[in-house]
């Protein structure tokens, strides 16, 4: 027959005033039969907190139903904790008798009524913004006591200075909350950037809590478009390519128009990522010159991340294409980019046929 052990797994429990504290206790055996009692303190002056057998304890409820068969969980929950509840609590097993006889005590759980802040939660803007715009990030942490707390912001490890912080309430309370808003200027290189909110509090013993947010959730990098024509093929087909580069996020739809009529629509998917986190995509269109009498106006229309479409047009000069193999080609690029373009060697192309 195994010897009964009374296990209190937590040496200490820290709880905010006004909240409930759960004090865990399990027994390793149903034998011997007898009730569990909880005491605060030891010795003759110890205070009875809860008795499974008898008494009225309005703030204390057993976590598990004591009437259920095989129950060996004698954990309790104490509601509405106040600073006066601090102390060491002991789970004590009694053997049934007249009176019941104290058999074995758990090691005790120290209840301290001061609370760590919750893990900081960082939230970013509801809608994406483009480079050079300023976006706001909010950091919130709750339930800590005492009120003194330090909050810092970082972007990619560099401390930020443009933020405002409030600790509420201003007066005395059982616990406090902190809210801080930082302003961050986006750059085209921020797809892989991260903002960090760091909270230091006396209860954390020098090991601050951190909340993070990825700027990839807040940034939109619109694409560059470039339409070019390749050499005419032997079968009188002209290969026109639309290079869509340096965009984020990946959500992008490309539509080819021939003389204003939709020729093909494609959705970007599973693109390789550039080192800076942006994407490139190349699509091409084969135009059968011999099928056209007049010049063909080709338009590459790109709708990126739900934004208004960006067009780049290109005219294939049919008159410049004699209907014979190996002739020279002529084309006119009539499109314009809608943003400045800084060239970059790191280009990956994804080809769709």
């Amino acid at each position: 027959e195994e010897e009964l052990q009374v296990i209190q797994p937590e040496k200490s429990v820290s709880v905010a005033a006004g909240e409930s504290a759960t004090l865990n206790c399990t027994a390793t055996s149903l034998i011997p039969v007898g009730p569990i009692q909880w005491f605060r303190g030891v010795g003759p002056g110890r205070e009875l907190i809860y008795s499974q057998k008898e008494g009225h304890f309005p703030r204390v409820t057993p976590v598990s139903d004591p009437t259920k068969r095989n129950n060996m969980d004698f954990s309790i929950r104490i509601s509405n904790i106040t600073p006066a509840d601090a102390g060491t609590y002991y789970c004590v097993k009694f053997r049934k008798g007249s009176p019941d006889v104290e058999l074995k005590s758990g090691a005790g759980t120290e209840l301290s009524v001061r609370a760590k802040p919750s893990a900081p939660v960082v939230s970013g803007p509801a809608v994406r913004a483009t480079a050079e715009h300023t976006v706001s990030f909010t950091c919130e942490s709750h339930g800590f006591s005492p009120r003194d707390i330090t909050l810092k912001w970082f972007k990619n490890g560099n401390e930020l200075s443009d933020f405002q912080t409030n600790v509420d309430p201003a007066g005395k309370s059982v616990s406090y909350s902190i809210r801080s808003t930082a302003r961050v200027v986006l750059t085209r290189r921020d797809v892989h950037s991260q903002v960090i909110c760091e909270v230091a509090h006396v209860t954390l013993q020098g090991d601050p809590l951190r909340g993070t947010a990825n700027l990839s959730e807040a940034i939109r990098v619109p694409p560059f478009l470039e339409v070019t024509q390749q050499s005419m093929r032997a079968d009188n087909q002209v290969n026109v390519t639309c290079q869509v580069t340096k965009f984020y996020p990946q959500r992008l739809q490309l539509t080819w128009l021939e003389n204003g009529n939709v020729s093909r629509t494609e959705m970007a998917s599973a693109l390789p990522e550039n080192k800076d986190g942006t994407y490139n995509w190349t699509s091409w269109l084969l135009v059968n010159v011999s099928a056209h009498r007049d010049d063909v106006k080709l338009t590459c229309q790109v709708e990126h991340d739900g934004q208004p479409a960006v067009n780049k047009s290109f005219s294939v000069k049919v008159s410049a294409h004699p209907k014979e193999q190996g002739s020279n080609t002529a084309a006119e690029n009539t499109g314009t980019n809608e943003r400045d373009y800084k060239d970059d060697d790191d280009k990956h192309h994804h080809h769709h046929h």
């Epitope: 149903l30 095989n70 049934k96």
Partner: antibody
């Protein structure tokens, strides 16, 4: 000190009903099951049913399921067992017993209530 | 339902001698690491009294001459040295499922 005090003896006619009470003291009534057991004259023990006063969960011996009803009144720490459609072979001492270890056993017993069914 | 059968139905033992009562279950009463078998003593005119719980554990206040043993389907209540006050009817009870009692064994002094 745990005590279970039962109501007094009853004489009933066949077809009638009887309701036996069991008042508990010396412990938290809602924390322990109450069992009901009967013993016919010169016979053995027969388990009738059990009830958890905290939520009125009940388990019945199939033999008594249609005729017995267990209830509790937590305000007075009293358990009740009603037996309907009495027959002469229901003549017995009816015991309430408390399950102190939640083992579906009977640790503390009342002194019993004699129910006599006779025309 | 699990049926408990006690043997013998009655037993006469001399004072100071060992008394042994058996209880056999129609199927195992072992579960969750415990044998859900209990022994009770009932003296004339009194309610039963719990002696042994979970097959082998003496209830508080029960003299150590009483012991329980067994597992699965076969269990034994032993009184190592019979005393005059041990004259009673002894019942086994299981709680592997809903409780049932054995038919009882009457113990007398020879």
């Amino acid at each position: 000190q745990v005590q279970l005090v039962q109501s007094g003896a009853e004489v009933k006619k066949p077809g009638a009903s009887v309701k036996v009470s069991c008042k508990a003291s010396g412990y938290t009534f809602t924390n322990y099951w109450i069992n009901w057991v009967r013993q016919a004259p010169g016979q053995g023990l027969e388990w009738i049913a059990m009830i958890d006063p905290s939520d009125s969960e009940t388990h019945y011996n199939q033999i008594f399921k249609d005729r017995a009803t267990l209830t509790t009144d937590t305000s007075t720490s009293t358990a009740y067992m009603e037996l309907r459609s009495l027959r002469s072979d229901d003549t017995a001492v009816y015991y309430c017993a408390m399950d102190y270890g939640s083992l579906y056993a009977m640790d503390y017993w009342g002194r019993g209530t004699l129910v006599t069914v006779s025309s | 339902d699990i049926v408990l059968t006690q043997s013998p139905d009655s037993l006469a033992v001399s004072l100071g001698e060992r008394a042994t009562i058996n209880c056999r279950a129609s199927k195992s009463v072992g579960s969750s690491g415990y044998n859900w078998l209990f022994w009770y003593q009932q003296k004339p005119g009194q309610p039963p009294k719990l002696l042994i719980y979970l097959a082998s554990n003496r209830d508080s206040g029960v003299p150590d001459r009483f012991s329980g043993s067994g597992s699965g389907t076969d269990f034994t209540l032993t009184i190592s040295s019979l005393q005059a006050e041990d004259v009673a009817v002894y019942y086994c009870q299981h709680s592997r499922e809903l409780p049932t009692f054995g038919q009882g064994t009457k113990l007398e002094i020879k």
